[in-house]
Interface confidence: medium
């Protein structure tokens, strides 16, 4: 079941998925001047069995000017250098994504891919938040959000994270209004059935992580 909602927006914070649940789709997008090869896939799909998950299909881009020449999937070093690195608070290596059953790793880049990756998340996906450089985290609880199914609709749980400027006094919820405000995002659980596939496993993984989990930005 795809999550037909956006993860919550936290002022001065970004989020990242450390691993992708089976069923997640990643658009095969090419950078300007390039396009998908005619017979190429529109998406990569995270699929698998009980023991192993991987991305089905390969994204391939070709020059918009040429007709039949397909580009190799392995990125060139200069292509990889194009990706900006975001300086976050005390960066660290992400946990081994392969250790989470039913999940795929971050797919490796393909040649001439777009600078932004577009994912379509599924129920049970967890994303982790961290304050951007220059802001520090004030925790009220877990700094993650999970896509859940409630009353037949998907929604993301609200991460308990506030990012405050280094020189500022502590901010509390409601003191700063994000540029775009969520439209009635529910924050409390209701008594009806909530689907949280693999939530237990993901929470255990989250417990082993610090808040500093971001190294690469696809923007």
């Amino acid at each position: 079941e795809l999550c037909d909602d956006d993860p919550p927006e936290i002022p001065h914070a970004t989020f990242k998925a450390m691993a992708y649940k089976e069923g997640t789709m990643l658009n095969c997008e090419c950078k300007r001047g390039f396009r998908r090869i005619k017979s190429g896939s529109l998406y990569m799909l995270c699929t698998g069995n009980s023991s192993h998950s991987s991305w089905d299909n390969q994204c391939q881009c070709t020059s918009s000017a040429t007709r039949n020449t397909t580009k190799q999937v392995t990125p060139q070093p200069e292509e990889q250098k194009e990706r900006k690195t975001t300086e976050m608070q005390s960066p660290m290596q992400p946990v081994d994504q392969a250790s989470l059953p039913g999940h795929c790793r971050e797919p490796p880049p393909w040649e001439n891919e777009a600078t932004e990756r577009i994912y379509h998340f599924v129920v049970g996906q967890m994303v982790y938040y961290q304050c951007v450089q220059g802001y520090r985290a004030l925790h009220r609880g877990p700094a993650e959000s999970v896509c859940k199914m409630t009353h037949g609709k998907t929604r993301w749980t609200q991460p308990q994270l506030i990012c405050t400027g280094e020189m500022e006094t502590s901010q509390f919820p409601g003191e700063e209004k994000p540029q775009a405000s969520p439209e009635g995002r529910p924050e409390s659980e209701t008594s009806c059935l909530v689907t949280t596939t693999d939530f237990q496993i993901q929470t255990e993984m989250a417990a082993t992580m610090e808040t500093s989990i971001f190294t690469t930005e696809y923007q």
Epitope: D6, T14, N27, I118, Y119, H120, Q179, A180
Partner: nanobody, 131 residues
Framework: EVQLVESGGGSVQAGGSLRLSCEAS?????????MGWFRQAPGKKEREFVG?????????SYADPVKDRFTISRDNAKSTVYLQMNNTKPEDTAVYYC??????????????????????WGQGTQVTVSS
């Protein structure tokens, strides 16, 4: 690539309402794109941000001159985004453009407000508000 076609423009009296539509076509899911509306007033070079909506409609953002008068919505099943214009004013007269941007599932600002951040544009539809 996504193609965008606006419709619904026309003439309206000040204080009246108009609903613009923008239909997207292309091989990629419409929910891959954040959508925005911009306008270009007569004699102005810059396209002015009107409002934007995130890819599932969870977040919206509006320019100050149109806040509380204009509403953006989207129907992903129909690959269409709408701009409902209420209580129109003569200064709303402009060519209105629909635009789309892609953003990462890993890092993103949910709505984008600057025209340079948009990757795809429609041809525009004329809106004239007379006093």
């Amino acid at each position: 690539e996504v193609q965008l076609v606006e419709s619904g423009g026309g003439s309206v009296q000040a204080g009246g309402s108009l609903r613009l539509s923008c239909e997207a076509s292309g091989p990629t899911l419409f929910s891959s794109y954040g959508m925005g509306w911009f306008r270009q007033a007569p004699g102005k070079k810059e396209r002015e941000f009107v409002g934007a909506i995130s890819r599932y409609g969870t977040y919206t953002s509006y320019a100050d001159p149109v806040k509380d008068r204009f509403t953006i919505s989207r129907d992903n099943a129909k690959s269409t985004v709408y701009l409902q214009m209420n209580n129109t004013k003569p200064e709303d007269t402009a060519v209105y453009y629909c635009a789309a941007y892609t953003y990462s599932g890993s890092f993103y600002s949910t709505v984008k407000t600057h025209h340079d951040e948009y990757h795809y544009w429609g041809q525009g539809t004329q809106v004239t508000v007379s006093s």
